[in-house]
């Protein structure tokens, strides 16, 4: 049977890394679905035996770690009672290049690099992208500039998966990396993310990225109804800020992990001349009383904006 093609993700990453990819397509993946990963052209699904180097873990495909031979196209097939969807991942695995001699002291000389921006004259933060299934424990984050480990001090302060950079100057741009230890079924792996950092003068009164909607506004919505709200973000092309919806300082997908009643959608983007316009939605399958008055916040790098659901005002006309 044919499946509707939803998306093709292109991923370029270094060998030796643990690598996860989560297949979600809300609202389809909120309900009872059969979700299976395949490596094309094989008709055999990826095993869900967690002891294997490559396996499916719930909605994730997990490589512990990646090898050059893992390059190829992977399909995630989502089936429910009525429909079938597929999401493809075109995975390119490169030779490991962590601070080798050919790199002239820079850990980031390859396409598998996150671009991030720090605002000159202000404080900013860099994100270490660490999204793995619950079966993986993550700790021991370290940060590097060039190949030198960054020590906490006045300039830098690590906080969870972020590196806070105080009083940003032009020379704070350059090649950064973060590493973390991943533990899975008693085995340890090292994750390394490479980050190319640009510094930018921030226009007065305007943040980059710029969230054009929401605007810390309220939305009238009836109890029990379904609601989809888009977060619209304009960002510079070279930036790879994280974009997500949070509630109570927690990703909505994590906060509503059990019920899946509220979920973040797949991000889409439109390329403009020197900027990209991103849209990431939040779906409320069924609005409950507890949702009213609670800020649901869209985050994009240093920018954030929220919506608050309010009960419809009765019309007494």
């Amino acid at each position: 049977d044919t499946c509707e093609d939803i998306f093709m993700h292109n991923v370029i990453i270094s060998e030796g890394q643990p690598f996860p990819f989560n297949c979600t397509y809300p609202p389809e993946t909120n309900g009872a679905v059969n979700l299976t990963w395949y490596k094309t052209p094989s008709k055999s699904p990826v095993s869900n035996n967690r002891h294997l180097r490559v396996h499916q873990d719930q909605t994730w495909i997990l490589f512990l770690p990646l090898t050059l031979e893992d390059s190829g196209i992977y399909q995630c097939v989502i089936r429910n009672a009525h429909n079938c969807y597929q999401i493809a991942v075109n995975l390119t695995v490169l030779k490991n290049h962590w601070c080798d001699s050919s790199m002239e002291g820079s850990p980031v000389n390859s396409p598998d690099v996150y671009q991030q921006i720090l605002p000159i004259g202000k404080s900013g933060s860099l994100n270490c992208h660490l999204y793995f299934p619950e079966s993986c424990a993550l700790d021991s984050i370290k940060w590097y500039k060039g190949c030198e480990e960054i020590k906490a001090g006045k300039k830098y302060s690590p906080s969870g998966a972020k590196l806070l950079v105080n009083n940003v100057a032009v020379e704070d741009g350059g090649s950064y990396a973060c590493s973390a230890r991943l533990t899975h079924l008693g085995r340890h792996f090292t994750i390394r993310n490479y980050i190319a950092v640009n510094t930018k003068e921030v226009e007065y009164g305007r943040r980059i990225p710029n969230i054009t909607y929401p605007k810390n506004n309220s939305i009238e919505v009836p109890l029990g109804s379904t609601l989809i709200v888009n977060c619209n973000i304009t960002d510079t092309k070279e930036n790879t800020n994280l974009r997500c919806w949070r509630v109570n300082n927690t990703l909505v997908d994590d906060y509503y992990k059990d019920s899946k009643r509220i979920q973040e959608g797949i991000e889409t983007n439109v390329s403009l001349r020197d900027q990209i316009r991103y849209t990431v939605n939040i779906t409320f399958l069924k609005v409950k009383m507890e949702d009213y008055g609670r800020p649901f916040t869209c985050h994009a790098g240093v920018s954030a904006a929220y919506i608050i659901l309010i009960y419809p005002v009765p019309d007494f006309r």
């Epitope: 993550l138 969870g160 998966a161 990703l251 992990k257």
Partner: antibody, heavy 120, light 111 residues
Amino acid sequence: EVQLQQSGPELVKPGASVKMSCKASGYTFTDYNMHWVKQSHGKSLEWIGFFNPNNGGTRYNQKFKGKATLTVQKSSSTAYMDLRSLTSEDSAVYYCTRQEIYYSNYFDYWGQGTTLTVSS
Amino acid sequence: DIVLTQSPASLAVSLGQRATISCKASQSVDYDGDSYMNWYQQKPGQPPKLLIYAASNLESGIPARFSGSGSGTDFTLNIHPVEEEDAATYSCQQSYEDPYTFGGGAKLEIK
């Protein structure tokens, strides 16, 4: 100022259950895993498990699976531990302690402890 | 599970002298250049207090007379010069893998 305030002492009968709490203040609750540690009288410390308030994940010491259940209430920044089918072996001081998610591997702040006595 | 064996189980040290406590792990607790070993101090009726993390890093606010060293399976806590207020039980703890485990403790008495 970081504080982990634990509930008061408990005296319960064998076979019963108990739920103790640990209220966190002075930091962002979701940035730290909440661990629980047992200390029997005159004995060393035993790790029970932890709850990750950020993603709802839990991890248990095999020895305490079926004995302890860890939960949190994010709205009140409170962690809970349920202990069931209690015996005299469960009499101990129970501590909650935090560990920064992603960053650290150590327990930097501890609650004052909840003393549990199981006796008929 | 990783077993941590501390020695001596108790020691008495004169004021101003050096106290040395050893912790031996049943397997290496090193990974990628880091040692996943921590040290805690505990006084009667109080919770443990973090002294040293990652084998040799002094926790903020802890006096510099406390130091930690070692790698692999062998770790040491040193206190020099010992002060009256250091009378306590000292425990090592590994965070290399779960279940996280603690040593049996070493009770320090000041002479």
